[in-house]
Amino acid sequence: GPVPPSTALRELIEELVNITQNQKAPLCNGSMVWSINLTAGMYCAALESLINVSGCSAIYRTQRILHGLCPHKVSAGQFSSLHVRDTKIEVAQFVKDLLLHLKKLFREGQFN
């Protein structure tokens, strides 16, 4: 896919940080989402997973940023091969896993 600008990745990281650090109650009421392979194409895979969570304002901005980073249109119920379809995790764990992976990519200078 296209290489997103580092500013968009920074924005995503800061938003994920904001979510993880400011949880006062279970994120999205403890909703479960499909785990994803944190590899190339993960922005679309992350969006495909999170877009199925409705009524959770805490992740609206994350969904919007991911829309901008994913080169194709994503809609609810859509799944790619990037999902680990036998594993569901809480949104809070999903967000933190994604955050730590993005931090690693940023440190290594890989923005794909």
Epitope: R10, I13, E14, V17, T20, Q21, N22, Q23, A92, K96, L99, L100, K103, K104, F106, R107
Partner: antibody
Framework: EVQLLESGGGLVQPGGSLRLSCAAS????????MSWVRQAPGKGLEWVSA????????YYADSVKGRFTISRDNSKNTLYLQMNSLRAEDTAVYYC???????????????WGQGTLVTVSS | SYVLTQPPSVSVAPGQTARITCGGN??????VHWYQQKPGQAPVLVVY???DRPSGIPERFSGSNSGNTATLTISRVEAGDEADYYC???????????FGGGTKLTVLG
């Protein structure tokens, strides 16, 4: 190779002032947050203050807020800690530490200086 | 303000596994870093981002973090691992860096 070298420590009387410096090399100084961490004799690590890469955001422990000021000169690759109204309980080894990332809330400290001893006593 | 609780001391025989815990309210939501400090020396980062190791740190050092407890695990402990170990997080509610009180690891024998 990343190097952090603190200086400016010494003996000062209660109520006095001291300015610590930390000369940094081996990395793009302005791209990383920096911090001061202290350790009183025989005690654990205590965070003192931190500053963003640009210097635009500063953070202080409650125990030093209003007395200590952190700053940086990115053109000189140097971090500073101005310490005023010093108290006996400020006696400690002061370490300069480099943050491992640009985002403040993800800070871990991947490089530390060897420390400079500040003794506050009459 | 946020509090991190570590056991003051942990003792282990050479070759065994040492586990040092760091307790905090919902610490699993935070990102934990671990430092090793030997007498008279500056701290050294041994685990960052819950479970990653900086280059040069042996694979024997590993970390985990979930719920209310983060754990630093040192397998096949050696005499040279004897040191103080500190956990650390960022507390967003106070904009403070927070360190645990430290754990002294003693290698027996």
């Amino acid at each position: 190779e990343v190097q952090l070298l603190e200086s400016g420590g010494g003996l000062v009387q209660p109520g006095g002032s001291l300015r610590l410096s930390c000369a940094a090399s081996g990395f793009t100084f302005s791209s990383y947050a920096m911090s001061w961490v202290r350790q009183a004799p025989g005690k654990g690590l205590e965070w003192v203050s931190a500053i963003s890469g640009s210097g635009g955001s500063t953070y202080y422990a409650d125990s030093v807020k209003g007395r200590f000021t952190i700053s940086r000169d990115n053109s000189k690759n140097t971090l500073y800690l101005q310490m005023n109204s010093l108290r006996a309980e400020d006696t400690a080894v002061y370490y300069c530490a480099k943050a491992d990332f640009w985002s403040g809330t993800l800070w871990g400290f991947d490089y530390w200086g060897q420390g400079t001893l500040v003794t506050v006593s009459s | 303000s946020y509090v991190l609780t570590q056991p003051p001391s942990v003792s282990v025989a050479p070759g065994q596994t040492a586990r040092i815990t760091c307790g905090g309210n919902n610490i699993g939501n935070k990102i934990v870093h671990w430092y090793q400090q030997k007498p008279g020396q500056a701290p050294v980062l041994v685990v960052y981002d819950d479970s990653d190791r900086p280059s040069g740190i042996p694979e024997r050092f590993s970390g985990s973090n979930s719920g209310n407890t983060a754990t630093l695990t040192i397998s096949r402990v050696e005499a040279g691992d004897e040191a103080d170990y500190y956990c650390q997080v960022w507390d967003s509610s106070s904009d403070h860096v927070v360190f645990g009180g430290g754990t002294k690891l003693t290698v027996l024998g």
